[in-house]
């Protein structure tokens, strides 16, 4: 039975040209995290294997930086970066947990961080 929950940075906004940290945290389970995948819509941005470390897609390596921790930093943001991002935790023996973050990249300086929320 999967008992864990993923806490994420929720709905967030950031300024065009700036950077943002996407962060997820898995709690309430003793399952071993074997890998975390970061995805944007239908694209795989990066993976972080518990043993082998980070592997960033060449398509994004200029604008994606690993960390902090299991999080992902997006740099040089453009309006096209607006959308859904997913952290996918592969665990043993539980299976897969998925967290969702919505990022809005704004033209102006009115960007504010949204509240944290949980996905069971």
């Amino acid at each position: 039975m999967m008992t864990g929950t993923i806490e994420t940075t929720g709905n967030i906004s950031a300024e065009k040209g700036g950077s943002i940290i996407l962060q997820c945290h898995l709690s309430s389970t003793t399952a071993q995290v074997t890998q975390v995948n970061w995805e944007q819509q239908d694209q795989l941005l990066a993976i972080c294997n518990a043993d082998l470390g980070w592997h960033i897609s060449p398509s994004f390596k200029d604008r994606v930086a690993p960390g902090p921790g299991l999080g992902l930093t997006l740099q040089s943001l453009t309006v096209n970066d607006t959308g859904e991002y997913f952290c996918i935790y592969h665990t043993y023996p539980d299976g897969t947990y998925t967290g969702r973050i919505f990022l809005e990249v704004l033209e102006s300086s009115v960007a504010e961080h949204g509240a944290r929320f949980q996905i069971p």
Epitope: T34, N37, D42, N49, D51, L52, G53, H55, H90
Partner: antibody, heavy 114, light 107 residues
């Protein structure tokens, strides 16, 4: 030049033990996760074990859990695979592999037979 | 575990031919796929990673494509030194798994 040189293979009886070693050079060993991948005669590839750069985390294939242990000594630039309770189906060439499988050693042959 | 199925299991082609090898994943793996070349009696060598990125030093006649569940390795003009067995591998989720291999021979 990246080099991975495996040793320690040989002929062993079922139930026996072997310890494989992999001497690494040409890169900063302590910065890379490492793996052991095996290939049974005439067969495909199977990931057997992985270990974090610091050695603090390891993962083993279900087929070897409880029998094999992966470890490393970063001061010696060496990766190990301790194989206990060996079975005939463990007969294979064992490869030492760097990181996300970008460099492979030449392999060492393990034969389990009575 | 994710199953990786390669086809064909073997093929024979003439020097200069265009050769295509396919790899199918049992579930969506996005672009988390690598291709390896193993020449007879040698260890595997990384050719392609992230489905389409050539490893440094790999000849341009080798190319990879695909996303999701269906992937292709293409040798645009087969050379005698390309005689080998080719394997795909997924690293979308653990345990990482390999395809069964495709043996390429020269007619």
């Amino acid at each position: 030049e990246v080099q991975l040189v495996e040793s320690g293979g040989g002929l062993v009886q079922p139930g026996g033990s072997l310890r494989l070693s992999c001497a690494a050079s040409g890169f900063t060993f302590s910065s890379y996760g490492m793996s052991w991948v095996r290939q049974a005669p005439g067969k495909g590839l199977e990931l057997v074990a992985t270990i974090k750069s610091s050695g603090g985390s390891t993962n083993l294939a279900d087929s070897v859990k409880g029998r094999f242990t992966i470890s490393r000594d970063n001061s010696k630039n060496t990766l190990y695979l301790q194989m206990n309770s060996l079975r005939a189906e463990d007969t294979a060439v064992y490869y030492c592999v760097r990181g996300y499988f970008d460099y492979w050693g030449q392999g060492t042959t393990v034969t389990v037979s009575s | 575990d994710i199953q990786m199925t390669q086809s064909p299991s073997s093929l024979s082609a003439s020097v200069g031919d265009r050769v295509t090898i396919t790899c199918r994943a049992s579930q969506d793996i996005k672009t988390a796929l690598a291709w390896y070349q193993q020449k007879p009696g040698k260890s595997p060598k990384l050719l392609i990673y992230w489905a389409s990125t050539r490893q440094s030093g790999v000849p341009s006649r080798f190319s990879g494509s695909g996303s999701g569940t269906d992937f292709t390795l293409t040798i645009s003009s087969l050379q005698p030194e390309d005689v080998a067995t080719y394997y795909c591998q997924q690293y979308y989720s653990t345990p990482y798994t390999f395809g069964g291999g495709t043996k390429v021979e020269i007619k």
